[in-house]
Every structure is written in structure tokens, then in C-alpha cells.
Amino acid sequence: LRLLDHRALVCSQPGLNCTVKNSTCLDDSWIHPRNLTPSSPKDLQIQLHFAHTQQGDLFPVAHIEWTLQTDASILYLEGAELSVLQLNTNERLCVRFEFLSKLRHHHRRWRFTFSHFVVDPDQEYEVTVHHLPKPIPDGDPNHQSKNFLVPDCEHARMKVTTPCMSSGSLWDPNITVETLEAHQLRVSFTLWNESTHYQILLTSFPHMENHSCFEHMHHIPAPRPEEFHQRSNVTLTLRNLKGCCRHQVQIQPFFSSCLNDCLRHSATVSCPEMPDTPEPIPDYMPLW
């Protein structure tokens, strides 16, 4: 988790002088509780936005927006703590809005936004806005939290972000898989414009099972420049196992920008349709 590299983060607006500060996620009001504390944020909304860094890179960001309740507690509102928690790693990043002037009621509801938390593709977050000072122990909570899901790199807008492009999101291998005679599969895919090797991972399964019955790995050497964007054709030999008929072909590239961690593409071949008429049952049963 990090903040987008903007020169100065701004939270001031007409009628309010405000500054954005880094925060340890442990506001002073936790340690020194105040008697009078503001009410919680209203209508917290988190949206996926996209922003450029000063270097021109495009990143997904969490756009956080909320409003204030129209009660007298805004007279005691000194700021807000914004927290983004990555759910699995428990990594947390916070910033603090510090109000340098007192809020007053005006004809419009006060609205705040912040769009500088960089988020990762395919990750899950909890976003919390805490009004400051935080409540006394056992006081009514004055925060609001929302869960937030960032799409993966297959999402149209995500695909062109810097982290997705670095993991190979622009490569579309257009995989085709064809079943041949003699227990073989022909795999065809489009090479990318980089002289890097690929790996084909074949996993086969029985018709309705999820436990594999055959696995095979095939290495494809780095193509020459004249082969970039051309189709690569590979024939894989299958294990002759009855019922081991559903095949998943996964292609793993090793681009220089993502090495072992590039996006993989896969295609699946289903088992052939079962005939409607059942097989005749033999009039004797083997004993083995």
C-alpha cells in the first residue's frame, strides 16, 4: 500500500482550511480521549478510479468520498483519519485530514474526497473513515467502513494500468486446443513481441472430477524477433487413460517485466459428449 506521488495532497475547500498529513493510524485522541466528539461520516462511498503519477504511469486508486451529518457535532470535528486495510496481509495505510479552521454549517452539506491510495489489481480492502477526535471508550463509534474489491487485470480499464501491463496484460495469446487422433492435443497460441520462453502446463481430469489424472509440462524456447506475434503450434501426447478426458492447458510466459509472476492464460477441452444409448451390459461379470 502506498500513496500516489502527488506534490501536495490537498483537502482544503471553500470555507475550510485543511491539510493532509501522514498518519500512524493511532490518533492522539485514542490515548487522550475528549469529552465532546463528532458523529460518524455519512454516505461513505469507495470507487475505483485511475490516476497518473508524475512519471506518467497509470495506477488504480481508491476514490473515497463521504459527507458530514447535519448536526451540531461538526463544531467539534477536528479532522478525519482515512485508513485502507489490505484484508489478507493486514497491511494498513492511513492519512489524516487536519482541519486548520472551524467548520460552520453552510447551505450545502460538507463533502470530502480523497483519491491517492494506490491499490493493487485483484486485491481486497477495507476502507475506514474515522472522524476526529475518536470517541471515548464505550462511546458511540464515529467511523464508517466499507469493503472494496479491485478487479483483476482482465477488467478492461485495469488492463492498461502500469501494474497490469508489467504482468503481461496486453498479451492475448488467443489459445486454441484441438484433440487429435492417437491421444494427442494440438495447442496453438500467439507469441508476444519479446524474446522470452514460455511454458505449457497440461492438466487432465476425469469427466466430473477435480482431481487430476495426468500432468505434463512443455517448455517453449524464446522466439526469434521474426517470430513475434506469430502462432506457435505444439503437439502434446496424452496418457492413454480411459475417462481422463478433460484437459486444461495453461500457458505461462516469462516476460522480463514480471519473470515468474506473469499472468497466465488457459483454455479447457471438455470431455466428449456421452452417447444417449447406454453401453450394452455383458451377460457375465468379470471377477477382477
Epitope: 462511498q45 469507495i46 470507487q47 484484508l87 489478507n88 496481509t89 493486514n90 481486497e124 467502513s145 466499507k146 469493503n147 472494496f148 474489491l149 478487479p151
Partner: antibody, heavy 116, light 107 residues
Framework: QVQLVQSGAEVKKPGASVKVSCKAS????????ISWVRQAPGQGLEWMGW????????NYAKKFLGRVTMTTDTSTSTAYMELRSLRSDDTAVYYC?????????WGQGTLVTVSS | DIQMTQSPSSLSASVGDRVTITCRAS??????LNWYQQKPGKAPKLLIY???NLQSGVPSRFSGSGSGTDFTLTISSLQPEDFATYYC?????????FGQGIKVEIK
């Protein structure tokens, strides 16, 4: 190929405990949390909570607080869900699933029957 | 807790039909909604996440739309393997909650 394989069916008496395991393969274990969802016979899905495979942090549904414990073993890429003080209405299929908010891969389910 | 209500409770359709299933949240979940398919005796399978994003490997005949409180799952041309129960699930607010499910049956 991402796979979550759960332990086998269990029959328990009321008041007993059950511990269901969920072994993952095909991905980096600490990259995604594990959620637990249950489904009573003929009923819908009920979220029980989740555990961070990275930090061990847990988040339980209020209904199960005090009765459920979720743990993980990083060395074997296995998650566990223990439910105590079982009652007959805990009879259900218990599923583990990868991730926290969108449950993209699921175990095959473990049927827990609570009967005297 | 947020209540998720699906309608209709069940529906009958034929192969090739366009099928629409709706899900309503008791309060806004913005786009924090997933759709799952479950066949008898099997675990649920994720179809759509974040209201409209197609999960990898799911056929493109499935699509999702909506935001706020009203959401729709559409199957553009029903296939034999699509006869199943469909659940919506909101994830914006804790605890995560599921709809009661809608069974799509063969007419």
C-alpha cells in the same frame, strides 16, 4: 490448478465439537484469505467468517462468536474451522473458499451431522 | 445486517431462452455484489464479481449489471448445463450476506 480439498463427513452428538480441515494447492497460500460458509440441508448459504492466511487475523460472523475458531497451518497450506457446542441446527455442509470478498474457489464441502 | 432478496424464487425456462434473475439489497451496496451458481451436491461457483465483472473461465453468456440496491444476472441463451440455483452475495458491508437463491428449472 487451484484446489481446496476438505476433510470427510462427520457425525457428532449435541454439545460436541467438530474440526473441519481445508487443504489448498495450486497457488501461493499466503496471498489469499480463507472464508468459511455453511449450507443447511435444502437451505441457502450462510457466511461464517474468514481468516487471513498471512497474519492469522480472523473476522467471525456475530452469530458464531464464542463458538467458532478458525486457524491455519502455513507449513501444510491448510485452514481449519472448529465449531463447538454443536446443536442439531448446526447440521450442514461446511465449505471453505479462497478469498474474503469474492469467493473464487471452493472446497467440495464437508457434511457435519449433529444427532443424538 | 443487509438483507438480500432474490426474485423470482424459482423459474422455469427452456434451452436458448434469455433468463434474468434479480437481487435487491436492503440498503445500498454500490457495486459490492457477486453472483454464484450451485448445482445439486456441488460447491457454489463464482460467476460475476463486483456486480458486472465476469469471473475468469465463465462463459460470456453470463452478465451482471446494477448498482446501489438493484442488481441483475442475465443468461443470454440458456444452456443445458445452466439449470442450477443462483445466489447473490453482497460484500460491501460486514457481515457478508447471501440471497436465498433462485432455482432455474427446465420448462
Amino acid at each position: 490448478q487451484v484446489q481446496l480439498v476438505q476433510s470427510g463427513a462427520e457425525v457428532k452428538k449435541p454439545g460436541a465439537s467438530v474440526k473441519v480441515s481445508c487443504k489448498a494447492s495450486g497457488y501461493t497460500w499466503t496471498s489469499y484469505g480463507i472464508s468459511w460458509v455453511r449450507q443447511a440441508p435444502g437451505q441457502g448459504l450462510e457466511w461464517m467468517g474468514w481468516i487471513s492466511t498471512y497474519s492469522g487475523n480472523t473476522n467471525y460472523a456475530k452469530k458464531f462468536l464464542g463458538r467458532v475458531t478458525m486457524t491455519t497451518d502455513t507449513s501444510t497450506s491448510t485452514a481449519y474451522m472448529e465449531l463447538r457446542s454443536l446443536r442439531s441446527d448446526d447440521t450442514a455442509v461446511y465449505y471453505c473458499a479462497r478469498r474474503v470478498l469474492r469467493l473464487d474457489y471452493w472446497g467440495q464441502g464437508t457434511l457435519v451431522t449433529v444427532s443424538s | 445486517d443487509i438483507q438480500m432478496t432474490q426474485s423470482p424464487s424459482s423459474l422455469s425456462a427452456s434451452v436458448g431462452d434469455r433468463v434474468t434473475i434479480t437481487c435487491r439489497a436492503s440498503q445500498s451496496v454500490h457495486t459490492g455484489l457477486n453472483w454464484y451458481q450451485q448445482k445439486p451436491g456441488k460447491a457454489p461457483k463464482l460467476l460475476i464479481y463486483g456486480a458486472s465483472n465476469l469471473q475468469s473461465g465463465v462463459p460470456s453468456r453470463f452478465s451482471g449489471s446494477g448498482s446501489g440496491t438493484d442488481f441483475t444476472l442475465t443468461i443470454s441463451s440458456l444452456q443445458p448445463e445452466d439449470f442450477a440455483t443462483y445466489y447473490c452475495q453482497q460484500f460491501e458491508h460486514n457481515p457478508l450476506t447471501f440471497g436465498q437463491g433462485i432455482k432455474v428449472e427446465i420448462k
